[in-house]
């Protein structure tokens, strides 16, 4: 039994449409069939849950309908996309992976991805 390691990029720049994508990769110590992935946001010392999804290995991630996250999985990699981001959402986004089934349970927490969001400049009035 070894503790689980989770890797994610250090920095990601959101697109002008407020979309940020990053890969969360975990080194699974066991053969999990059910995995829970949670995206956490850390601002100052406060940690909040952005979104969470549980998936069966080989199947798609299913976030809640009103979630700002979408994702796909491939083996021990999860491709996460966060939408609707604004400049005020700039911060550290942590990928948390839990191997839920079969036992034993394992926890893995990444070091976080700093997502920078720049609000687009408003379009200047056009003179016609």
């Amino acid at each position: 039994c070894k503790a689980m390691h989770v890797a994610q990029p250090a920095v990601v720049l959101a697109s002008s449409r407020g979309i940020a994508s990053f890969v969360c990769e975990y080194a699974s110590p066991g053969k999990a069939t059910e995995v829970r992935v949670t995206v956490l946001r850390q601002a100052d010392s406060q940690v909040t849950e952005v979104c969470a999804a549980t998936y069966m290995m080989g199947n798609e991630l299913t976030f809640l309908d009103d979630s700002i996250c979408t994702g796909t999985s491939s083996g021990n990699q999860v491709n996460l996309t966060i939408q609707g981001l604004r400049a005020m959402d700039t911060g550290l986004y942590i990928c948390k992976v839990e191997l839920m089934y079969p036992p034993p349970y394992y926890l893995g927490i990444g070091n976080g991805t700093q997502i920078y969001v720049i609000d687009p400049e408003p379009c200047p009035d056009s003179d016609f």
Epitope: R36, K96, E98, M100, Y105, Y106, L107, I109
Partner: antibody, heavy 118, light 107 residues
Amino acid sequence: QVQLVESGGGVVEPGRSLRLSCAASGFTFSSYGMHWVRQAPGKGLEWVAVIWYKSSEKDYADSAKGRFTISRDNSKNTLYLQMNSLRAEDTAVYYCARAGLLGYFDYWGQGTLVTVSS
Amino acid sequence: EIVLTQSPGTLSLSPGERATLSCRASQSLNSYLAWYQQKPGQAPRPLIYGVSSRATGIPDRFSGSGSGTDFTLTISRLEPEDFAVYYCQQYGIYPFTFGPGTKVDIK
């Protein structure tokens, strides 16, 4: 603010059963794993059981397997520990604790004392 | 099962002194190690998580360090309210285990 309040402790004879409850408030109960931890008089902390987000996802310490059952009612924001076939060595203060978003036990109840004695 | 060993069992110090508590794991924990403080008749209180991050409301005289299997909790200057029992815990792998505790008492 987050609050966890245990109840259901008391004096019980060996071989009998007891059900502990932990009433949670101040957070979205269904989004967190919940643990039971116990502490025998004058001893250290011993993890007993955990129940995760889905009620089917549970784990137990070896000392609790087969005798204790952890459950939760998300509609009532309540955690339970059903303890059967109690032994003298189960005498302890039982705490419920929340598994925080970063994994450690970030909030604890005040504890409820279970005494198993004839 | 991961076994956590704490030393010393008891640490006798005076207010204002520095306290150094050790926790050793039987296998690598990555960073899934926490420290809790417990006073008589009270529930444990989280101090440190993720080896070195302070929990909410914990003063900066408490600090955690270490990696792999060896971890340390340091109290830079003991205040009267710091005399208590301190437990380390690993929370990354089932079963979740606690160390036996270190009692910090007044010399």
